[in-house]
Interface confidence: low
C-alpha cells in the first residue's frame, strides 16, 4: 500500500504565447485539476479506467479572465493531490493529468466546466524514490509538476510489497527475517504463487510453490501415499494404481485483472484486486467515487451490479470513461467543400466563396430555391445571381413597388406610359424608335431602321420592359 | 470492429497433430480478454476446447487436455491450438472466439473445417 | 463438469408466435458475491459462427432485438423469442461460462410452423 502523490507548479501558456480558448469565459474562474493513474507502458485503451485509482484538486483561487490581455501564469489550487494504492505500486504507469476550469457565471445549473488541456504521459518510477519533475505542452498551454510515489508502513521497497516492521517494536517474529543491511527492520519472506498451501508448501522465490515431504500438486494440496496407494480416492495412474495430482482448479489462473486464485474444495476463489470483483475478477468495480468518468462526464452508478457506474458524456466526447473525442468533422458535416472546425464546444463551417449557412449548404451563385418576388426571374453569371424584375417591380428579390417611367426612358421628349407587359413611348415630332432614340430625316427616310409599314413617326412605341432591343 | 480469422491445413492424418492459428483484428491479444478455441463436429453441437490469457495462463476442457496446447503470440497478435493424437472423432469445424472476461464470447471466427483422414 | 441439457431438441413455431427454449444445469451457476449467473445464449444459423444473443443470463448483447430475452436464475434458464420472425430460424445453444470449464447445452432447432 502507499500513496501517489502529484505537485502542480504552475499552469500558464507556453512559450508560444496566450492560447486562445475556444470557450471565451466570461466573469470569474478558477482552476481544478483531475489526477488518473493506469497500469502499465502499454497503450491504454481511451476509454479504460482508472485502474490504479484518480483524485481531484480542490478548487483555485478565484481569477478573472481579461480577453485581451495575454493570460499569466493561473492561480492554482493549494496542496497535493494524492492517490492511494491498496496493492503493489506497479512501477510503470500511465499519468493523465486535466487542468478544467470552473466559471462561476449565473449559469442556470451551476457552474459550469471546460477542459484547458490533457497531457498523457507514460512514465516508470519506484516507489520510494524522490520527487520527479516534469515540463508537459498540452496545446498553447504549459503544465509544470512533479511527483513521487512512497510507501506507507509497514510496506516498504520499490513496489511497496516488503512488509516491514520497526525492530524496536518487536524483534523479528515467526515467518519475519531481518531487512536489507542498514534498515532497522524485519520483511516477510517472498510471496508465494497465489493459493499455495500455507501448511504444505513453501517458496523461496516468489511466485513458487515447493511442496513439503507427503504433498504434492501445483499448489501442494494432494497428499502423497508411502505405502501401496492403493485405497486412496481420487485419480490414479493406469501405471503403478498411486494418486497422480489432477487438474488443479487454479491451473492457468483462471483470475482476471490481476486477480489471485486460491483452490477450495471441488473449485476456487480469486482475490480480486482493487477496481474489480466477480468469480473471476471479471466485473470493473470502480464506482463514481473514483472519478472515472473524463472531460465533464456526468457519473451515476450503474444499475446492474457489473456496471458499477455510467458516464454520460458531454457532447463531442465518447467512451465508458468520456475519454475518446468525437472526431466530428471526420463526419464532414460541411458541404461544398467547407472546412471543418471543432471548436469543442460547438462546430463551425468556413465556406468557401459562393457558398454559406451553418454547413455552407446554401450556394449563393444557385437560383435553385432562390425566390424572385412579384414574377421577377433569376438570372445566374458572373459568380452570382440576380433576379430580372417583372415590369413594376424592382431591388434585388423584386419586392420593391417600381414606376417604370420613373427613369424616363423615351429621349427627345417623348411621353412614357406604363402597360402592364411593359413601357410605351410616344415620341415627339422627328422622333422614333421604341425609346424615340432615332431621328427622323426631313425627306421622310430615317438615319436607321425605316419604322415598319403602318406606323407613323410620333406613334407611341411598345417596349417590353424585359427586352434590351426590340425593334418593329 | 473486432474480427478473428482461423487459418491451418484443412486435412490432418489419424495420430498426427492438428495446428490452427487464430488472427487478431481490432483488438490488442494483450487486452482484458481470454481467447478461445470451440469446435462443432458435422451436424453436431458445439464444444469447447479451452482458453488462453495473454499471460499465457490457459484453461483446458478437461476431456481434451491430454491433447491440448494453446498459446499466444504477442508479437503476431495471433493465439493457436495444437491438438495431438487426432482421430476421426476430432473431425470439426474448429472456431476460434473472444471471451470477454467473464467467458461469453462475443465475437467469432468465421470457422474452418479440420478433417481427419488418411 | 457442468452439463448443460436444453429442451426440446426442436420447436416449430408460427410466425409472430412466442417461441421458448429451457435450460438446465446439472450445478448452480450463480456466483453469490455478485449475484451473476455466469450462462449465455447463441444463435446459429446453417453456415455461420455462433452469435452471442444474451450474457449473463439476461443481459442482451448489443445489437440484439428486443424480441429476444433471457430469464431464470440457478439452474433453470430460459430464452424466449416473443414474435418469431423468418430470420430467427436457427439452432440455439446455452452455455455456462462458470468456473474454469465451459459447457454448452446440445442446442434446439427453431423452425417455423
Known amino acids: 500500500a502507499g500513496v501517489f502523490e502529484l505537485q502542480i507548479h504552475s499552469f500558464g501558456p507556453g512559450p508560444g504565447g496566450a492560447p486562445r480558448s475556444p470557450y471565451s469565459a466570461r466573469g470569474p474562474c478558477r482552476l481544478f485539476f483531475r489526477v488518473c493513474l493506469k497500469p502499465g507502458l502499454s497503450e491504454e485503451a481511451a476509454e479504460s479506467p482508472c485502474a490504479l485509482g484518480a483524485a481531484l484538486s480542490a478548487r483555485g483561487p478565484v481569477y478573472t479572465e481579461q480577453p485581451e490581455a495575454p493570460a499569466p501564469d493561473l492561480p492554482l489550487p493549494n496542496g497535493l493531490l494524492q492517490v492511494p494504492f491498496r496493492d503493489a505500486w506497479p512501477g510503470t504507469f500511465s499519468l493523465i493529468i486535466e487542468t478544467w476550469r470552473e466559471e462561476l457565471g449565473d449559469q442556470i445549473g451551476g457552474p459550469a466546466w471546460s477542459l484547458l488541456a490533457r497531457v498523457t504521459r507514460r512514465r516508470r518510477l519506484a516507489a520510494g524514490g524522490p520527487w520527479a519533475g516534469d515540463i508537459q505542452r498540452a496545446g498553447a498551454w504549459e503544465l509544470r509538476f512533479s511527483y513521487r510515489a512512497r510507501c506507507e508502513l509497514p510496506a516498504v521497497g520499490t513496489a511497496c510489497t516488503r512488509l516491514c516492521r520497526p525492530r524496536s517494536a518487536s524483534r523479528c517474529g515467526p515467518g519475519l527475517r531481518p531487512c536489507a543491511p542498514l534498515e532497522d527492520e524485519c520483511e516477510a519472506p517472498p510471496v508465494c504463487r497465489a493459493g499455495c498451501s500455507l501448511e504444505h508448501g513453501f517458496c523461496e522465490q516468489p511466485g513458487e510453490c515447493r511442496c513439503l515431504e507427503g504433498w504434492t500438486g501445483p499448489l501442494c494440496m494432494v497428499p502423497v501415499s508411502t505405502s501401496s496407494c492403493l485405497g486412496l480416492r481420487g485419480p490414479s495412474s493406469t501405471t503403478t494404481g498411486c494418486l497422480v495430482p489432477g487438474p488443479g482448479p487454479c491451473d492457468g489462473n483462471p483470475c482476471a485483472n490481476g486477480g489471485s486464485c486460491s483452490e477450495t474444495p471441488g473449485s476456487f476463489e480469486c482475490t480480486c484486486p482493487r477496481g474489480f470483483y466477480g468469480l473471476r475478477c471479471e466485473v470493473s468495480g470502480v464506482t463514481c467515487a473514483d472519478g472515472p468518468c473524463f472531460n465533464g462526464g456526468l457519473c451515476v452508478g450503474g444499475a446492474d451490479p457489473d456496471s458499477a457506474y455510467i458516464c454520460h458524456c458531454p457532447p463531442g466526447f465518447q467512451g465508458s470513461n468520456c475519454e475518446k473525442r468525437v472526431d466530428r468533422c471526420s463526419l464532414q458535416p460541411c458541404r461544398n467543400g467547407g472546412l471543418c472546425l471543432d471548436l469543442g464546444h460547438a462546430l463551425r463551417c468556413r465556406c468557401r466563396a459562393g457558398f454559406a449557412g451553418p454547413r455552407c449548404e446554401h450556394d449563393l451563385n444557385d437560383c435553385a430555391g432562390r425566390a424572385c418576388a412579384n414574377g421577377g426571374t433569376c438570372v445566374e453569371g458572373g459568380g452570382a445571381h440576380r433576379c430580372s424584375c417583372a415590369l413594376g417591380f424592382g431591388g434585388r428579390d423584386c419586392r420593391e413597388r417600381a414606376d417604370p417611367c420613373a427613369a424616363r426612358p423615351c429621349a427627345h421628349g417623348g411621353r412614357c406610359y406604363a402597360h402592364f407587359s411593359g413601357l410605351v413611348c410616344a415620341c415627339a415630332p422627328g422622333y422614333m424608335g421604341a425609346r424615340c432614340e432615332f431621328p427622323v430625316h426631313p425627306d421622310g427616310v430615317s438615319a436607321l431602321p425605316a419604322a415598319p409599314p403602318g406606323l407613323r413617326p410620333g406613334d407611341p412605341q411598345r417596349y417590353p420592359h424585359h427586352h434590351h432591343h426590340h425593334h418593329h | 470492429q473486432v474480427q478473428l480469422q482461423e487459418s491451418g491445413p484443412g486435412l490432418v492424418k489419424p495420430s498426427g497433430t492438428l495446428s490452427l492459428t487464430c488472427v487478431v483484428f481490432?483488438?490488442?491479444?494483450?487486452?482484458?480478454?481470454?481467447w478461445s478455441w470451440v469446435r462443432q463436429p458435422p451436424g453436431k453441437g458445439l464444444e469447447w476446447i479451452g482458453e488462453v490469457f495473454h499471460s499465457g495462463s490457459t484453461n483446458y476442457n478437461p476431456s481434451l487436455k491430454s491433447r491440448v496446447t494453446i498459446s499466444v503470440d504477442k508479437s503476431k497478435n495471433q493465439f493457436s491450438l495444437k491438438l495431438s493424437s487426432v482421430t476421426a472423432a476430432d473431425t470439426a469445424v474448429y472456431y476460434c472466439a473472444r471471451a470477454a472476461v467473464a467467458g461469453a464470447l462475443d465475437y467469432w471466427g468465421q470457422g474452418t473445417l479440420v478433417t481427419v483422414s488418411s | 463438469d457442468i452439463v448443460m441439457t436444453q429442451s426440446p431438441d426442436s420447436l416449430a413455431v408460427s410466425l409472430g408466435e412466442r417461441a421458448t427454449i429451457n435450460c438446465k444445469s446439472s450445478?448452480?451457476?450463480?456466483?453469490?458475491?455478485?449475484?451473476?449467473?455466469?450462462l449465455a445464449w447463441y444463435q446459429q444459423k446453417p453456415g455461420q459462427p455462433p452469435n452471442l444473443l444474451v450474457y449473463?443470463?439476461?443481459t442482451r448483447e448489443s445489437g440484439v432485438p428486443d424480441r429476444f430475452s433471457g430469464a431464470g436464475s440457478g439452474t433453470d434458464f430460459t430464452l424466449t423469442i416473443s414474435s418469431l420472425q423468418a430470420e430467427d430460424v436457427a439452432v440455439y445453444y446455452c452455455?455456462?461460462?462458470?468456473?474454469?470449464?465451459?459447457?454448452f447445452g446440445q442446442g434446439t432447432k427453431v423452425e417455423i410452423k
Open positions: 449473463w443470463a439476461s
Open positions: 450445478q448452480s451457476v450463480l456466483y453469490s458475491s455478485n449475484n451473476k449467473n455466469y
Open positions: 481490432g483488438d490488442s491479444i494483450s487486452s482484458s480478454n481470454w
Open positions: 452455455q455456462q461460462y462458470y468456473g474454469t470449464s465451459w459447457t
